[in-house]
Interface confidence: low
């Protein structure tokens, strides 16, 4: 049997919404279907229908369609908002363009390119003709509205009203010409539903032909209505996937706005000599990352492949070689000259100084007794006498109840990283709250370094699976999938929660993200009776500066043979100078001659004052980071990933001591590697484990 | 569409371009690939062209072809050809990475056939 | 890297089952890096099956492909004499510097 053709994408689809006639003589028409899709198919081909249908309601809670000769912008008709109605109008009778030669074109235009109003096609005064309305079923020849019912050159025309001139074009401008964009029209929310090729766009909620994640209510911001045309994913301009099987997406032709200004909503603010927020808006000239390697120029394609060109990305400026930031990563980056070294942060910009003049503490902040009240991310906080009972869960002494007047950001565990406050929300139960520290202030924050070197292991042996020492496996390691590739390493430190870098997250979607335990290959080759897979439900940021993020499961990890933990060491210890340690990583370049396994780099322990002589004075260092080098002259940079571990051993216990950030770099002869360091923030990973519900298993 | 040609008797030693031809494609989002077929024998994937136009070869085919590309066409140099390539070629689309991130080839060509001899 | 293809020739009867099956010698680059193609005598191949199994478009729903790793099966159910032809399996693997595309030798469909 032929299949017939689905045609709902030649509406406009508004949720939650019926038409009321208010003239009662509009006729309608009603049935009990399935889908929104029967009632479109009925409506297009005008099947069973007393009258040419221009648009239809279908209630979802009944299972019936409504269908109209009317649409919202008739006459005698008014809009309603109702939760199990959807209104479908036929773009043909609203559209106020043409696609090519206009054959579907069904507006309302009656005037001609030189001004004259057309005559009524049922009428044969001032010019007879064989264009009746009877004998174009379908083509929509009403009233005197330009058309062009066999598809001419030209466009939409009609017979005019003037004697002298028989018929005339009408001036109905093409939709590709009145549609425009700004940038790479990632903010386009026009109506262009058909491709540069002219094939009919597939609607966004629909996965046939083509099965896509694009999906209108997983990414509400993106504006995937209908079938238009959108830009959700970076690409040079707005695409959209086809109707036609064989072609499972094009690009759209839509012209570029002669003024090309962006909403103000949409401006980064520009800065030239330090940078606000991620730095999209950076505008400056810094053209070498981090480290001082020199950035590629973003019109060249070597050594680096890549479409990030001045071209794809119009209004970001990618002039030259400077860091920039067009992708909404972390922070301006670039490619680099290095053929080893494909992309780079450039972390030595400055942060444009947001905290002068705002409220600052001393130490760690635990005699703060300011009045802000708001976390970092914007909550509110809630009072501390409704929170007591939590607070007594985490802390061993019974609190200051004077300081913990009101909903005020405090200090009452000695949180090492500053004055926090709990929020009224369930997922984030507490967070830091937007205070610096005082300028100039050198108070320790650790607040044990006085006393005897704590050891970093905690005293207990090797645990044992299964009569294997779990220090020869390396289950604990993490392979973060962004948009289905590796992006990023990490280690497993509970079965809910993985501890890895702030930079692995480009996007805030939290959909875009899996974990893979258990694997030895990147891509999973071999592994499948071993691998987990196991979706993100939250990501909990570090304290400010830390570069590191919690990321939680969707449901813990099942620990087995080739799935474990790793330990984390006690808060606030030092390892000795020339521990042997490692880092682990995929070490993943994109180039198709990688092989996808997992390696190693053997380093030591380095204090932090030779540390800083080895980087020739260019680095201090402070409580919160850890320094190790290569053990042997010749040794390339080690192969881990951001986020990925730098593991010792002490006691024969193994532990995650540090973690891979940009910025700081791995370790290559006489440039040893600066990692964050674990045990500064060990007491911040305990509270949050401790405070933060996870999914049983 | 996809269209080779170039195809003819040489000599060995002699080399030879095969030009392909698309039509409706952007080779800007599209990859290419040169895939060829001896005579009663099966497929043998010779190398394919980034949509950047970075060429990459099957480790066989390395310094043996060089493929370029300036649009609309894909060329594939035979730079010393034996008797052992005479097969008949075929350059094809491969799928884009929106419906996979493997490479797999989803419009051919019609082929053009090459015969080394003396 | 090696795809052997079993058996060949094969010959069903029409509204039979065919299965051919498609054995590397190492895992994929992907764990569905793999693709079935049929060929029919003076024409180029024509893609039926990517990532293992999904079905290209136009293809009709009686070829069905399925298996990981290094073992990979195509199934036609209900042979139709339109469906003799030579099917060539594709992986993509990792060697030295480059992804490796190997095809399987070919298994030719001969329908009664």
């Known amino acids: 049997q032929r299949k017939r053709r689905n045609t709902i994408h030649e509406f406009k689809k508004s949720a939650k919404t019926t038409l009321i006639k208010i003239d009662p003589a509009l006729k309608i028409k009603t049935k009990k279907v399935n889908t929104a899709d029967q009632c479109a198919n009925r409506c297009t081909r005008n099947k069973g229908l007393p009258f040419t249908c221009k648009a239809f309601v279908f209630d979802k809670a009944r299972k019936q369609c409504l269908w109209f000769p009317f649409n919202s912008m008739s006459s005698g008709v008014k809009k309603e908002f109702g939760h199990e109605f959807d209104l479908y109008e036929n773009k043909d009778y609203i559209r106020n363009c043409i696609i090519g030669k206009g054959r579907s074109y069904k507006g309302t235009v009656s005037i001609t390119k030189s001004g004259i109003k057309c005559q009524p096609w049922s009428s044969m005064i001032p010019h007879e003709h064989s264009f009746l309305p009877s004998s174009y079923r379908g083509k929509d020849l009403q009233e005197n509205y330009c058309r062009n019912p066999r598809g001419e050159e030209g466009g939409p025309w009609c017979f005019t009203s003037n004697p002298e001139v028989r018929y005339e074009v009408c001036d109905i401008p093409q939709c590709s010409e009145v549609e425009c964009m700004t940038c790479n029209g990632e903010s386009y929310r026009g109506l262009m539903d058909h491709t540069e090729s002219g094939k009919i766009c597939q609607r966004w909620d629909h996965q046939t032909p083509h099965r896509h994640k694009f999906l209108p209510e997983r990414y509400p911001d993106k504006g995937f209505d209908d079938n238009y045309c959108r830009n959700p994913d970076g690409q040079p301009r707005p695409w959209c996937y086809t109707l036609d099987p064989h072609t499972r997406w094009e690009y759209c032709a839509i012209k570029t706005c002669a003024d090309n200004t962006m909403n103000d909503t949409d401006v980064p603010l520009e800065t030239t000599e330090c940078i606000q927020g991620q730095g999209e808006g950076y505008r400056g000239t810094v053209n070498t990352i981090w480290n001082g390697i020199p950035c590629q120029r973003w019109d060249s394609q070597y050594p680096h492949e890549h479409d990030m060109t001045p071209e794809n990305f119009k209004c970001k400026d990618l002039r030259e070689n400077y860091c920039r930031n067009p992708d909404g990563s972390e922070s301006p980056w670039c490619f680099t000259t290095d053929p080893n070294i494909r992309v780079g942060y450039c972390s030595q910009i400055p942060n444009c100084d947001m905290s002068h003049g705002q409220d600052c503490y001393r130490g760690n902040g635990k005699n703060y007794m300011g009045n802000l009240s708001q976390t970092r991310s914007g909550l509110t906080c809630s009072m501390w006498d409704k929170n007591m009972e939590d607070l007594h869960r985490h802390i061993f002494w019974e609190p200051d109840a004077s300081k913990l007047n009101e909903n005020y950001c405090r200090n009452p565990d000695d949180d090492a990283h500053g004055p926090w406050c709990y929020t009224g929300n369930p997922l984030i139960p507490w967070d830091y709250c937007p205070i610096s520290r005082c300028e100039g202030d050198t108070t320790p924050t650790i607040v044990n370094l006085d006393h005897p070197v704590i050891s970093c292991a905690k005293t207990k042996q090797l645990r044992v699976v299964n009569g294997i020492p779990t220090r020869t496996n390396i289950g604990w390691m993490v392979s973060l999938r962004y948009r289905n590739k590796h992006i990023c390493g990490g280690s497993l430190i509970k079965e809910s929660w993985v501890l890895t870098a702030r930079q692995c997250f480009p996007s805030r979607d939290l959909k875009d993200y899996e974990a893979w335990l258990g694997i030895h290959d990147v891509h999973g080759r071999g592994d499948e009776k071993c691998k987990q897979v196991l979706n993100v439900s939250q990501l909990v940021y570090g304290p400010e500066g830390s570069d590191l993020v919690l990321m939680k499961l969707a449901r813990p990890a099942v620990l087995d043979d080739f799935v474990s933990t790793i330990d984390l060491p006690n808060y606030g210890c030092t390892i000795p100078e020339k521990t042997s340690c490692s880092v682990y990583g995929w070490g993943y370049t994109g180039l198709i001659n990688y092989d996808g396994l997992l390696r190693v780099a053997h380093l030591y322990i380095m204090g932090n004052e030779k540390c800083s002589q080895h980087h020739r004075g260019k680095v201090t260092l402070n409580e919160s980071e850890i320094c190790a080098g290569a053990e042997k002259i010749g040794s390339g940079p080690c192969e881990g990933d951001y986020g990925g571990p730098l593991v010792c051993e002490q006691h024969k216990m193994r532990m995650v001591l540090g973690v891979i950030v940009p910025g700081r770099g791995c370790a290559i002869p006489n440039r040893p590697g600066i990692f964050v360091r674990v045990a500064y923030y060990a007491k911040w990973i305990h509270k949050i484990i401790l405070t933060y519900k996870v999914p049983q298993s | 569409s996809v269209e080779e040609s170039g195809g003819r008797l040489v000599t060995p030693g002699t080399p030879l371009t095969l030009t392909c031809t698309v039509s409706?494609?952007?080779?800007?989002?599209?990859?290419m690939g040169w895939v060829r077929q001896a005579p009663g024998k099966g497929l043998e994937y010779i190398g394919m062209?980034?949509?950047?136009?970075r060429a990459w070869y099957a480790t066989w085919a390395k310094g043996r072809f060089t493929i370029s590309k300036t649009s609309p066409t894909v060329d594939l140099k035979i730079t010393s050809p034996t008797t052992e390539d005479t097969a008949t070629y075929f350059c094809?689309?491969?799928?884009?990475?929106?419906?996979?991130?493997?490479?797999?080839?989803?419009?051919w060509g019609q082929g053009t056939l090459v015969t080394v001899s003396s | 890297q090696v795809l052997t293809q079993t058996p060949s020739p094969v010959s069903a009867a029409v509204g039979g089952t065919v299965t051919i099956n498609c054995q590397g010698s190492?895992?994929?680059?992907?764990?569905?890096?793999f693709s079935w193609y049929q060929q029919k005598p003076g024409q180029p191949p024509k893609l039926l099956i990517y990532?293992?199994?999904t079905l290209a478009s136009g293809v009709p729903s009686r070829f069905k492909g399925s298996g990981s790793g290094t073992q990979f099966t195509l199934t036609i159910s209900g042979v139709q004499c339109a469906d003799a032809a030579t099917y060539y399996c594709?992986?993509?693997?990792?060697?030295?510097?480059?992804?490796?595309?190997?095809f399987g030798g070919g298994t030719e469909v001969v329908v009664k």
């Open positions: 094809a689309r491969l799928i884009d990475e929106r419906s996979t991130y493997s490479y797999v080839f989803d419009l």
């Open positions: 409706g494609i952007d080779l800007s989002n599209y990859a």
């Open positions: 062209i980034g949509v950047n136009g």
């Open positions: 190492q895992s994929l680059y992907n764990n569905n890096a």
């Open positions: 990532d293992a199994s």
């Open positions: 594709q992986g993509e693997f990792s060697c030295g510097d480059v992804d490796c595309i190997a």
